[in-house]
């Protein structure tokens, strides 16, 4: 039961944790005009990984793409390349993790190869997270180091009699977005990681067998995965399985031929 | 059609107050920030104040700064300038203009109330 | 705040001649984000409040005829008319739309002769 759970929720926290990457990834709002101490312009900058957009006084918006791929630097490249990695592991992850879910049968999956599904799919939301917290921190990187750049610009005299209006970047919502998004496919998929050490069989997979206890009218009987939440009669917590490859749903509980002397 | 309608203007003595109003039609105001230009006798243009249309921003120039104040009733459809500590060179036509869609424009120009400050 | 310089500050033209005229500002009004210069021209005519001309330095407005036209970028603008007519004859303001508080040119006065 503790094991289902752990892997439900790993698979939803992965989950809403993917769509947060994916729509940090699409946001515009990367880098938004800092308004703090600047002087102040009747229009609104932010920009994005795809587009850079400005808001004027009235609420119009434009957005313009960067319909360049060498002008572009470098640190942005790799920044949309992690994202994109982020999403296409995270994507990959949430396809093998519906198959590895405890409470969806298919066919006659080995509850092993649940196991090594449920460990592969933790693995690939880990460095799902991963790439999407290092692209966000890149960013932010790149922003705080061009901040102090462009103040240091404003306050140190200019060449010519003419003035340029220093547009600053500061940290825009999709900065929290991918932390936050990142941060949760990581936990999801240590949870995933933590349910594939329930799942997996720890020892060689043996026949059950019904012992006859004297004086006693009690039968050890195959108990399953109930072995390892405290319903079997398991008491050293390890696995027994009945050699079949049947779901925990299939395990039987009632009474049957082999359960009275 | 488009419309602003100024009023308030009269002859204020210095340091005295006065309230200008804008009476607008024709479109929708609460979607529209809104702006206050003046026009002394035989001089430029002179913009005054801004009020965007949700009025969370509201900005003066520095010769009016702390003596006039811009405000908006929505649902009236009117746009206000209070205007205290009134001085000579306070003395033009003020004009009530739309702030245009595209491009940061003044769009629609009312025409205008004549203000004379004088002892 | 930005100044805004118009030259000359009169103009004697006559009927079908091309004009142009001048507004340089103190401060850039290029906006790198959308490529847009935040410049607008108005004319007024004696005894009417102005009508909005151009924005975005070069987009001539609804309704404005097409023998205005407006060019520039950063800090140097003009405003173009190709022929001038006796309608035209008014005072031209070019305005700094980009940074609080918005600021007027003196204007340009376009006379016939």
């Known amino acids: 039961m503790a094991v289902t759970a752990c892997q439900g929720l790993g698979f939803v926290v992965s989950l809403i944790g993917i769509a947060g990457i994916i729509a940090a990834t699409c946001m515009d709002q990367w880098s938004t005009q800092d308004l703090y101490n600047n002087p102040v312009t009747a229009v609104f900058n932010y920009q994005g990984l795809w587009r850079s957009c400005v808001r004027e006084s009235s609420g119009f918006t434009e957005c313009r793409g960067y319909f360049t791929l060498l002008g572009l630097p470098a640190m942005l490249q790799a920044v949309r390349a992690l994202m994109i990695v982020g999403i296409v592991l995270g994507a990959i992850g949430l396809l093998v993790s519906i198959f590895a879910l405890k409470c969806i049968r298919i066919g006659s999956m080995e509850d092993s190869a649940k196991a090594n599904m449920t460990l592969t799919s933790g693995i690939m939301f880990i460095v799902s997270g991963l790439c999407a917290i290092a692209g966000v921190s890149v960013f932010a990187n790149m922003l705080v180091t061009n901040f102090w750049m462009s103040t240091a610009n404003m306050y140190t005299g200019m060449g010519g009699m003419v003035q340029t209006v220093q547009t600053r970047y500061t940290f825009g919502a999709a900065l929290f977005v991918g932390w936050v998004a990142g941060g949760l496919t990581l936990i999801g998929g240590v949870m995933m990681c933590i349910a594939c050490r329930g799942l997996a069989p720890e020892e060689t997979n043996y026949k059950a067998v019904s012992y006859h206890a004297s004086g006693h009218s009690v039968a050890y009987k195959p108990g399953g995965f109930k072995a390892s939440t405290g319903f079997g009669s398991n008491t050293k917590n390890k696995k027994i399985y009945d050699g079949g490859a049947r779901t925990e749903d299939e395990v039987q509980s009632y009474p049957s031929k082999h359960d009275y002397v | 059609v488009v419309q602003l309608v100024e009023s308030g203007g009269d002859f204020v003595q210095p340091g005295g107050s006065r309230k200008l109003s804008c009476a607008v039609s024709?479109?929708?105001?609460?979607?529209?920030?809104m702006h206050w230009v003046r026009q002394a006798p035989e001089k430029g243009l002179e913009w005054v104040a801004y009020?965007?249309?949700?009025?969370?921003?509201?900005y003066y120039a520095d010769t009016v700064k702390g003596r006039f104040t811009v405000s908006r009733d929505n649902p009236k459809n009117s746009l206000f300038l209070h205007m205290t500590s009134l001085r000579s060179e306070d003395t033009a036509m003020y004009y009530c203009?739309?702030?245009?869609?595209?491009?940061?424009?003044?769009?629609?120009w009312g025409q205008g109330t004549p203000l004379t400050v004088s002892s | 705040d930005i100044v805004m310089t118009q030259s000359p500050s009169s103009l004697t033209v006559t009927a079908g001649e091309k004009v142009t005229m001048s507004c340089k500002s103190s401060?850039?009004?290029?906006?790198?984000?959308?490529?847009?210069?935040?410049l607008t021209w108005y004319q007024q005519k004696p005894g009417q409040p102005p009508k909005l001309l151009i924005y975005?330095?070069?987009t001539r407005e609804s309704g404005v005829p097409d023998r205005f036209t407006g060019s520039g970028s950063g800090t140097g603008f003009t405003l173009t008319i190709s022929s001038v007519q006796a309608e035209d004859l008014a005072f031209y303001y070019c305005?700094?739309?980009?940074?609080?508080?918005?600021?007027f040119g003196l204007g340009t006065k376009l006379e016939l002769r």
């Open positions: 401060q850039s009004l290029f906006n790198s984000g959308n490529q847009r210069n935040y």
């Open positions: 975005w330095a070069s």
């Open positions: 305005q700094n739309v980009y940074i609080y508080p918005l600021t």
């Open positions: 009020i965007s249309s949700g009025t969370t921003n509201i």
């Open positions: 024709g479109f929708t105001f609460s979607s529209f920030g």
């Open positions: 203009v739309r702030s245009g869609y595209y491009g940061n424009s003044l769009d629609y």
